[in-house]
């Protein structure tokens, strides 16, 4: 499978809510011996590989925000911890995987990464990730609502798979 990022850039006004989205593409094994681990984190655009570094989102680590389930099951973070920080990650039956951030501030601007790992009994992990930029703006130049910019078809297909 691969991960696609439908949008590569989100431009939002301060105070708004935003939902960043990744999508699993391709066949997803739903067997009893496979588990999917999905999470979000902030990162930096590395010279060699984007999304290598795992920084917290609003002080929550990638482990605080992770989802853990089989196949295309739906899941979401029930952590009070995440919700207290205005965050919720969720996954639906169709391969969509998102994080919602409430009441954005300028400090939320940056690069965000989704990570999906297929974990199988006796097999090495299959790891894929996607990246997107969030720009939070204030003042008269800020949009009234979030504006999203689609990834180019090349970007959404050329996702790192390790």
């Amino acid at each position: 499978f691969k991960v696609a990022t439908p949008y590569s850039l989100y431009v939002c006004p301060e105070g708004q809510n935003v939902t960043l989205t990744c999508r699993l593409l391709g066949p997803v094994d739903k067997g009893h011996d496979v588990t999917f681990y999905k999470t979000w984190y902030r990162s930096s655009r590395g010279e060699v590989q984007t999304c290598s570094e795992r920084r917290p989102i609003r002080n929550l680590t990638f482990q605080d925000l992770h989802l853990h389930h089989g196949g295309h099951q739906a899941a979401n973070t029930s952590h009070d911890l995440a919700q207290r920080h205005g965050l919720e990650s969720a996954s639906d039956h169709h391969g969509n995987f998102s994080i919602t951030m409430r009441n954005l501030t300028l400090l939320d601007s940056g690069l965000y990464c989704c990570l999906v790992v297929e974990i199988r009994h006796h097999h090495s992990e299959h790891r894929v990730h996607g990246a997107m930029e969030l720009q939070v703006q204030t003042g008269k130049d800020a949009p009234s609502n979030c504006v999203v910019y689609p990834s180019s078809s090349q970007d959404s297909e050329n996702i790192t798979a390790a």
């Epitope: 011996d33 588990t35 681990y37 999470t39 590395g46 060699v48 590989q49 290598s52 570094e53 795992r54 990638f62 482990q63 992770h66 853990h68 990570l115 790992v117 974990i119 199988r120 009994h121 006796h122 097999h123 090495s124 992990e125 790891r127 390790a162």
Partner: antibody
Framework: QLQLQESGPGLVKPSETLSLTCTVS??????????WGWIRQPPGKGLEWIGS???????YYNPSLKSRVTISVDTSKNQASLKLNSVTTADTAVYYC???????????WGQGTLVTVSS | DIQMTQSPSSLSASVGDRVTITCRAS??????LAWYQQKPEKAPKSLIY???SLQSGVPSRFSGSGSGTDFTLTISSLQPEDFATYYC?????????FGQGTKLEIK
């Protein structure tokens, strides 16, 4: 703060089974998204990964040891265990338990315990 | 199995020196490489993950670089507490493997 503590016999006879326990404090061994692994280091030598167990129960072993090794967890005791059977003197080493998150390296280690195989 | 080869196997340096240790993988491992520091009678301590990302709490004089098969660990200005043995480890695929170690000694 997470702490890992290995325990078990310091001396095992050749052909017998080496059994070690890793007791986890400051966190739950059943937390999803983590592996519990064992690494060993013969005296004066380098590190060798023995195997890991994922929170959902999946196991991963080094092929060089696979026929002799079993890693398991006891969630009620918050412990991981290592069993290595048919030991020889080549299995003399410091044995470490360690934790690693999904798609990450070993970020928390126990202090290690020396196991000597000798008659 | 992926073989990890470190060089040099030992190194003598002085406080304040800049030191570089290299690690080569027998096949490509993307950026799935970690560096550890180990002092005598102690467990290894993670310094770098994902080839170049500093583990929380590790001094910024440590840095890592590389991707694919060739990687380096650099200590920009050696401190007395940095004299130890350093190991690289690939976590691209099982079985996870370590380099043979580089012992950093005081000149």
């Amino acid at each position: 703060q997470l702490q890992l503590q290995e325990s078990g016999p310091g001396l095992v006879k050749p052909s017998e089974t080496l059994s070690l326990t890793c007791t986890v404090s400051g966190g739950s061994i059943s937390s999803s998204g983590y592996y519990w692994g064992w690494i060993r280091q013969p005296p004066g030598k380098g590190l060798e990964w023995i195997g890991s167990l994922y929170s959902s129960g999946y196991t991963y072993y080094n092929p060089s040891l696979k026929s002799r090794v079993t890693i398991s967890v006891d969630t009620s005791k918050n412990q991981a265990s290592l069993k290595l059977n048919s030991v020889t003197t080549a299995d003399t080493a410091v044995y470490y338990c360690a934790r690693h998150p999904v798609a990450m390296n070993f970020d928390d280690w126990g202090q290690g315990t020396l196991v000597t195989v000798s008659s | 199995d992926i073989q990890m080869t470190q060089s040099p196997s030992s190194l003598s340096a002085s406080v304040g020196d800049r030191v570089t240790i290299t690690c080569r993988a027998s096949q490509g491992i993307s950026s799935w490489l970690a560096w550890y520091q180990q002092k005598p009678e102690k467990a290894p301590k993670s310094l770098i993950y994902a080839a170049s990302s500093l583990q929380s709490g590790v001094p910024s004089r440590f840095s890592g670089s590389g991707s694919g098969t060739d990687f380096t660990l650099t200590i920009s200005s050696l401190q007395p507490e940095d004299f130890a043995t350093y190991y690289c480890q690939q976590y691209n695929s099982y079985p996870y493997t370590f380099g043979q170690g580089t012992k950093l000694e005081i000149k």
